[in-house]
Amino acid sequence: IPVIEPSVPELVVKPGATVTLRCVGNGSVEWDGPPSPHWTLYSDGSSSILSTNNATFQNTGTYRCTEPGDPLGGSAAIHLYVKDPARPWNVLAQEVVVFEDQDALLPCLLTDPVLEAGVSLVRVRGRPLMRHTNYSFSPWHGFTIHRAKFIQSQDYQCSALMGGRKVMSISIRLKVQKVIPGPPALTLVPAELVRIRGEAAQIVCSASSVDVNFDVFLQHNNTKLAIPQQSDFHNNRYQKVLTLNLDQVDFQHAGNYSCVASNVQGKHSTSMFFRVVESAYLNLSSEQNLIQEVTVGEGLNLKVMVEAYPGLQGFNWTYLGPFSDHQPEPKLANATTKDTYRHTFTLSLPRLKPSEAGRYSFLARNPGGWRALTFELTLRYPPEVSVIWTFINGSGTLLCAASGYPQPNVTWLQCSGHTDRCDEAQVLQVWDDPYPEVLSQEPFHKVTVQSLLTVETLEHNQTYECRAHNSVGSGSWAFIPISAGAHTHPPDEFLFTP
C-alpha cells in the first residue's frame, strides 16, 4: 500500500499556503482527486509529489494515491481543508445527475472542519427541503440525499453557520432521472387498415416512457412523415402521439406504415399495412376440404374464413339436405374475429346422426354482395352383413348383402364345425369377391353390395361365413346348415344364424 507524507488523515491549511503531498510506493504511483486549479505534479519513479504554492478553498478535497501495478489495488488518502473565512464551501459540481432510488451526493465540501456542527441543506432562496427528504452529511464528501426521488429534482444550497450567520454555497442542481427500463412502449392503431378509394382513414402512432427524453416518428414506406406531435403526461408516463388523418385515400397512400420510438436505451418499432381497394370485397375460404367424410357418431367442426371490407351485414349456416329440412342449431354456430377484416365462422356438429349427412352452406353478405361456401358431408358406416340361402337358375346359392360406407369388400370363408365366426384353425377354404355387385350407391347414403357363392352341396357340420370390411370396420354373418342331404333344400329347412 502506498504511503502519503504528511502521514495524517486530514490536513488543515490557510489560503495562500504551500501544500506538498508526497506519495511513495513499491512501484510507480499516481495521484487522484477532484480537478482543481494550481496543482503541480512531479513524478520520480516510485514517488509522486502533488504540490501547490498558492492553496485556495478550491483545493479542498480528498486526494488519493494508488499504485497501478498493485494487483490488490491498495490506496492511501489524505483530506485537505483550505480554511477560508470567506468561503466555507468548496462545491465540486454544478449539477448532480442520478437515477431514482440512488443516493444523491451533493458535493459541498466544508473548507473548515470546525463548521460541521452548524451545517444544513436547503433549497435555493431559503426554501425548506421537501417533506420526507432523508439526508446525511460528511465534511469530506458533502450532503447525501438517500434514495432520491424524481420529485426531488431541485436546486439546492449548502448552509454553514459562521459567526452566528448562515453562509450559503453556490447552488447545485439535482436531476433525478427515472429509471428507463428500455426503449419507449409503442402502439400503432389500427394494426391493419383497409379502405375503399375516396374514404377517410386515420392512423395513430403513440409512444410512452417514464422519461421525457425520447423521440417518435411515423414513416410510410421508409419516408418519415411530418406530423404535428401531441404530448401528454398521465399515469406517471410521458406520452407522444402522432395522428395521420387522410380525408380521401388513394392508392398512393397504401403500403407499410412504421411507428418508431427511441431513447438512450434503444429503439422500438412496430408496423402495419394499409390497403386501398377499388371496391368492397367479400372472400370465403376454408382450410378444410369442402368434401368431408366422418364416421357416424363422431363430431365435426366446419370452419369458414371470411375476408371482407366493409364489415359483414349478415351471415348464416344452412343445411341443404337431402335427409330432412332441419337447420343447424344457432348455438352450434360460432364466430371469432381474427382481426378487423378476417373472421372465422365455425359450425359444430357433435355426434353425427345418419340424417345429418348432406350439404351445409355458409352464406355471408356485405355491401360487395352475397357469397356462399358449401361443404358436402358424407358419413362413414361400418358394414352390416346378412346372408340368405336361395336358388338361382336352379343352383343352390348363398347370397350375402353388405351395406356401409365406404363401399365394403367381401370375403367368403368355409370352415369346419358350427361357429359364429370362423377362426384361422378351422378355415377350409377362402374366396375373395373382388367385384361384388353394387345394388345402391346414392350420394350421402350407404353403399350396398351383393356377393353370390354357388354351393352344389351344403356340407354337414360346416359353417359358411360372409365377411365384409371397409376403412371404418368390419361385419360378418355365419350361415350354418342344420342338416345335410340332397343337393337342394328349400330355405325354410335351414336355420339362419346372424
Epitope: W31, H38, W39, L41, V97, P107
Partner: antibody, heavy 117, light 110 residues
C-alpha cells in the same frame, strides 16, 4: 490499460438531441473523473464537461444550458446529451479520463457526429 | 476562437530541434500548470507532457516542456518523421473553472 469506446448515432437532425455513450473497459469507472471533449473538423479541442462516478457534473459555461451528463456505474458507462443541436455542433466527440493536475491520460478513439437534415 | 494561442504551423527537418509556443493569460497559464497533447493523423490526442514538464511513461525524452509567466513551450529535439502531427497545449482556466486548449499547431517534418 484503460480503454474507452464512444458510441451513438453518427447523424443528428438540427434541433434534435445528440446522445452519446462512453463505455469504460479494463478498469473501473468509480473514483475517477470522466470528460467529454469535442473537435470540429480542422479545428482545436473544446472541453464540454466532466462527470464523477457519484453523478457530480461540471460543464463548460458556453454549453451548460444544453448539456446533461449521466453515469451508470453498473454498466461502467457515462453518457452525454446535447440538446437543440445545430451544424456548429458537428465534430468528433471524444471521451477521456481526467486526472488531478488537469490532464487527460486516456482517450476514446472518437466518434464523428454530423448535424444535418 | 481558442483561449490559448498557438502558431497554426511549424516545421523542421529530421534531427532538428523545433519549439512550439503557447500563450495564455493570468487566469490559465499564469496560475496553473500546462499540459501538451500529440494528435497523429486520424487518431485521438495522446498525453505528451503534464504539469509543465513531466513526461508520462513511454514518451521519449526528446520531448520537453517549460513554462514562464503566461506562456509555455514544447520542444522536440532530434526531430523524426513520426513526430509529424498536431500538437495542443492545455491548462486549467480559473474563470472557466475547467480546462482550456490551444488551437493546435500542425508540425511538418520536411
Amino acid at each position: 490499460q484503460v480503454q474507452l469506446q464512444e458510441s451513438g448515432p453518427g447523424l443528428v437532425k438540427p434541433s434534435e438531441t445528440l446522445s452519446l455513450t462512453c463505455t469504460v473497459s479494463v478498469g473501473s469507472i468509480s473514483s475517477y473523473y470522466w470528460s467529454w471533449i469535442r473537435q470540429p473538423a480542422g479545428k482545436g479541442l473544446e472541453w464540454i464537461g466532466r462527470i464523477y462516478a457519484s453523478g457530480s457534473t461540471n460543464y463548460n459555461p458556453s454549453l451548460k444550458s444544453r448539456v446533461t451528463m449521466s453515469v451508470d456505474t453498473s454498466k461502467n458507462q457515462f453518457s452525454l446529451k446535447l440538446t437543440s443541436v445545430t451544424a456548429a455542433d458537428t465534430a468528433v466527440y471524444y471521451c477521456a479520463r481526467e486526472r488531478v493536475g488537469i490532464y487527460f491520460d486516456y482517450w476514446g478513439q472518437g466518434t464523428l457526429v454530423t448535424v444535418s437534415s | 476562437q481558442s483561449v490559448l494561442t498557438q502558431p497554426p504551423s511549424a516545421s523542421g527537418t529530421p534531427g532538428q530541434r523545433v519549439t512550439i509556443s503557447c500563450s495564455g493569460s493570468s487566469s490559465n497559464i499564469g496560475s496553473n500548470t500546462v499540459n501538451w497533447y500529440q494528435q497523429l493523423p486520424g487518431t485521438a490526442p495522446k498525453l505528451l507532457i503534464y504539469s509543465n514538464n513531466q513526461r508520462p511513461s513511454g514518451v521519449p525524452d526528446r520531448f520537453s516542456g517549460s513554462k514562464s509567466g503566461t506562456s509555455a513551450s514544447l520542444a522536440i529535439s532530434g526531430l523524426q518523421s513520426e513526430d509529424e502531427a498536431d500538437y495542443y497545449c492545455a491548462a486549467w482556466d480559473d474563470s472557466l473553472n475547467g480546462p482550456v486548449f490551444g488551437g493546435g499547431t500542425k508540425l511538418t517534418v520536411l
